[in-house]
Structures are given as C-alpha cells and as structure tokens.
C-alpha cells in the first residue's frame, strides 16, 4: 500500500522550493583577499526538480521568483603589510534569499 | 565595544578542532560484562563547527583527518566464572584520539 | 591531513632564474595566505614571500624585493616562487608555509626543496 | 631590522629535566593592532620546522602541555618542564610584528 501521505512529503522534498545551501561569503561578494568568518553561511536558494515546464520547453529550471536581501553579522579578516597582524572588525554582509520560485523554460524545441 | 581579540579566540574555539571529550570505556569498548576504573577517560575527538566545504555542499561536518590509539593503563573487574567475587586486572586500553580535523561535506545538492 | 609538497630545486648559476612549486592538499587552499621561508646553509631562517589568500596582496623583504615573485593557483591548490638574478647568497632550502587566519601565525609547513646558486 | 637573540646557543639537558630558552629582541614586539606576534618553532633533525607556540603563549594544537610560551615586550621565554626524548633538536623563536619578519638564531637541544 502506498502512503499517500508520504509520498507527497517527498514530492515536496525534490520538488523546486527554496532550501538551505551553504554559500561561501568570498565567492559571493568576490572578496578574495578577505577572509570571513564562518566563511559560509546557510541561505534558502531554489532548488530540486521541475516536473513539468510547456509540452515543447527543453530545459526547465528552478529559479527565483521572490529575492530578498538579508544582512548577516560576520569578523572579516584583511592583510595588512607585512605578513602578521591582519586586520579584523565586524561587518554586516547581505547575502540573497530566495523566497519563492518557480519552473521556468530555458530552452524550447523547434516544434 | 566589541574586543576582535576574544571573538577571534572565541572562533578558534567553536571552529572545528580536536578537543577533549569524556568517553566511557565500557561504551567505547562494548564490554557490558566488565566494569573499568576510571570509567571514563579523556580523549581527544573532533569537535566544533565547520564554516565551508563545497559551494553546493548541504551538511559539512567534522571529521577526523588523522588518528592515532593511545593506550590507556585502567583497572578491569570481571565477574568470576563460578564463583563470587570479582577478578581485578590491570589492563591497557586502546582508546582513537584525533590528531587533525578537517570539514567534509556529506550531502551535496542537486544544484 | 594538511600537506605541502614543495618542488623545483635546482643548481643554477649566478645570475640565472628558477620557478619553485608548492602542492597543497588536504585543506581548502584559496581560504589561506602562503608564504616562502628559506633555511640557509648555517641553518639560519630568513623569510623570502607571503601572498593573501586571493593572490592580491603581496609582501617581500628588501632582500629579494625586485627579484622573486610569489603567486598562486587556486584551481591547481598551487603556491608558486619565480626567482630571477640568483645570487650564491640565496642558496637554501626553501619552505611554504601556511598562513593560519584565526591564529595568525604560519601553521604548517613543507618539507622543502633545495636551491643551490654556484657557477 | 628586529634583532632576535636567542640563549643558550646550545641547551644539553637529562631527559626529564626543565629546559628554559630565552629570546630577546632588540625592541619592541608589539604590534601597532596590540597583539604580540612572537612564534616558537621546533626542528628535528631532517625535519622542516613545526610550530609549537603562537602569539608569545598559545600552544598550537597537537603540541603537549609540557611546553609553554611567556614573556612581553622584548624578553620571551620557552619553558619544557619535563624534556622527553622526542622534544630534541633546534629551537627558533620568530617575531611577526614588524617587516621584515625575523627569526632567532636557534637553540640545539641536545641531551647531557
């Protein structure tokens, strides 16, 4: 017998929903002398599968259809000259979180 | 005003290091049968927070990198086949210390 | 486990040029700075270049400034060390060295690769 | 540039016994952000050198409680207060404060 119950969960589970991904602060503000700490933090991103774009779509993708910016307190850690003493403070980062998403097509047939 | 100097001591501390942990011998060893004096013993396990692994990495954990037995001098008790009493030994017990830490991922997402 | 494997050494003559390689694993490379020690013959320590953990910043003591260039490649995990106008007072054993950020301090270090300048 | 002046040149010590380094360094080695970047570094024979104490008294992790790190200013001090055999070879201390970072001569421990 199947659990309908549970089968839905897992729908909801793989289908295209923000969820929480890692995000490494350097690669998303492109800082690369910079050092953060944590250096990743946990954002909600679209994520999982599209079942169903139009009947022609090639390609259907998960993307964001709601983005907000939200602030996150961070200790940034700089080189200063010479090879000691980096330079630290505390620093409010804005990272994007994805609060609704949608399946849309990226890539439609010919036909 | 926030010191840099004990938040930066306060990440080394949280961030993912090997650290002391009590661990009981009887667990450790799985000997139900057998009591151990001291019961616990101090051993050095990975412990802490990992900021990164992979950009699509869902759960990064701890894990050790580099592990080495110590051995232990405890005292063991035993219940005597047959008879009343208990059989004390002195004994030396092979307890995993964790010498390197490094942050893993085990769960990567679809993305 | 955290490895630094240096290559590249060489007998070069006065005056030559030589590039050094340090192969880093076990850790995520582009999050550290790195840098370049040399032990000289007399066993004396002398730091030769540290690099940021994104390849921008630089520093270099008067002694090789102008002559030896540090960089880096991320995607390789790999530190380099290009030295020009070698002179016999550079004959070492050259180290890299990780740059700890939260500790500040160089961490781990090479087993290191011999350089000797002699015509 | 900072002189770093290590003593004794050569320390021979009984395994067991408290093994005290001293560095000096010809100013001071505070850093204009008000930490002390003063390292000790042990090499073995064969060895690269590992790094046993940071910012004058912070063990480095893995490095046994019987080595400790003191001292300010321009006077620091290595202290092993048991020498086991594993602990022999040459001691460096470093100063990171100032450009160019330098380090000491070395102290060779060797045993008695």
């Known amino acids: 017998v199947v659990d309908l119950n549970l089968l839905t969960e897992e729908v909801r589970l793989y289908s295209c929903t923000p969820r929480n991904f890692s995000v490494s602060i350097r690669e998303e503000l492109k800082r690369t002398d910079t050092i953060f700490w944590p250096g990743c933090l946990l954002v909600k991103r679209c994520g999982g599968n599209c079942a169903c774009c139009l009947h022609n779509c090639n390609e259907c993708q998960c993307v964001p259809s709601k983005v907000t910016k939200k602030y996150h307190e961070v200790l940034q850690l700089r080189p200063k000259t010479g090879v000691r003493g980096l330079h630290k403070s505390l620093t409010d980062v804005a990272l994007e979180h994805h609060e609704e998403c949608d399946c849309v097509c990226r890539g439609s047939t010919g036909g | 005003v926030v010191d840099l100097n004990l938040l930066t001591e306060e990440v080394r501390l949280y961030s993912c290091t090997p650290r002391n942990f009590s661990v009981s011998i009887r667990e450790e060893l799985k000997r139900t049968d057998t009591i151990f004096w001291p019961g616990c013993l101090l051993v050095k396990r990975c412990g802490g927070n990992c900021a990164c692994c992979l950009h699509n990495c869902n759960e990064c954990q701890c894990v050790p990198s580099k592990v080495t037995k110590k051995y232990h001098e405890v005292l063991q008790l035993r219940p005597k086949t047959g008879v009343r009493g208990l059989h004390k030994s002195l004994t030396d017990v092979a307890l995993e210390h964790h010498e390197e830490c490094d942050c893993v991922c085990r769960g990567s997402t679809g993305g | 486990e955290v490895q630094l494997v240096e290559s590249g050494g060489d007998l070069v003559k006065p005056g030559g040029s030589l590039k050094l390689s340090c192969a880093a694993s076990?850790?995520?490379?582009?999050?550290?700075?790195m840098s370049w020690v040399r032990q000289t013959p007399d066993k004396r320590l002398e730091w030769v270049a540290t690099?940021?953990?994104?390849?921008?910043?630089?520093y270099y003591p008067d002694s090789v400034k102008g002559r030896f260039t540090i960089s880096r490649d991320s995607a390789k995990s790999t530190l380099y060390l290009q030295m020009s106008s070698l002179k016999s007072e550079d004959t070492a054993i050259y180290y890299c060295a990780r740059q700890a950020p939260l500790w500040d301090c160089s961490d781990y270090w090479g087993q290191g690769t011999t350089l000797t300048v002699s015509s | 540039d900072v002189l770093m002046t290590q003593t004794p040149l050569s320390l021979p010590v009984s395994l067991g016994d408290q093994a005290s380094i001293s560095c000096r360094s010809n100013?001071?080695?505070?850093?204009?952000?008000?930490?002390?970047?003063l390292e000790w570094y042990l090499q073995k024979p064969g060895q690269s050198p590992k790094l046993l104490i940071y910012k004058v008294s912070n063990r480095f992790s893995g490095v046994p409680d019987r080595f400790s790190g003191s001292g300010s200013g321009t006077d620091f001090t290595l202290k092993i207060s048991r020498v086991e055999a594993e602990d022999l070879g040459v001691y460096y201390c470093?100063?990171?404060?100032?450009?160019?970072?330098?380090f000491g001569g070395g102290t060779k421990l060797e045993i008695k």
């Open positions: 100013q001071s080695i505070v850093h204009s952000n008000g930490d002390t970047y």
């Open positions: 076990g850790f995520t490379f582009s999050n550290y700075g």
């Open positions: 470093f100063q990171g404060s100032h450009v160019p970072p330098t």
């Open positions: 690099i940021g953990s994104g390849g921008h910043y630089t």
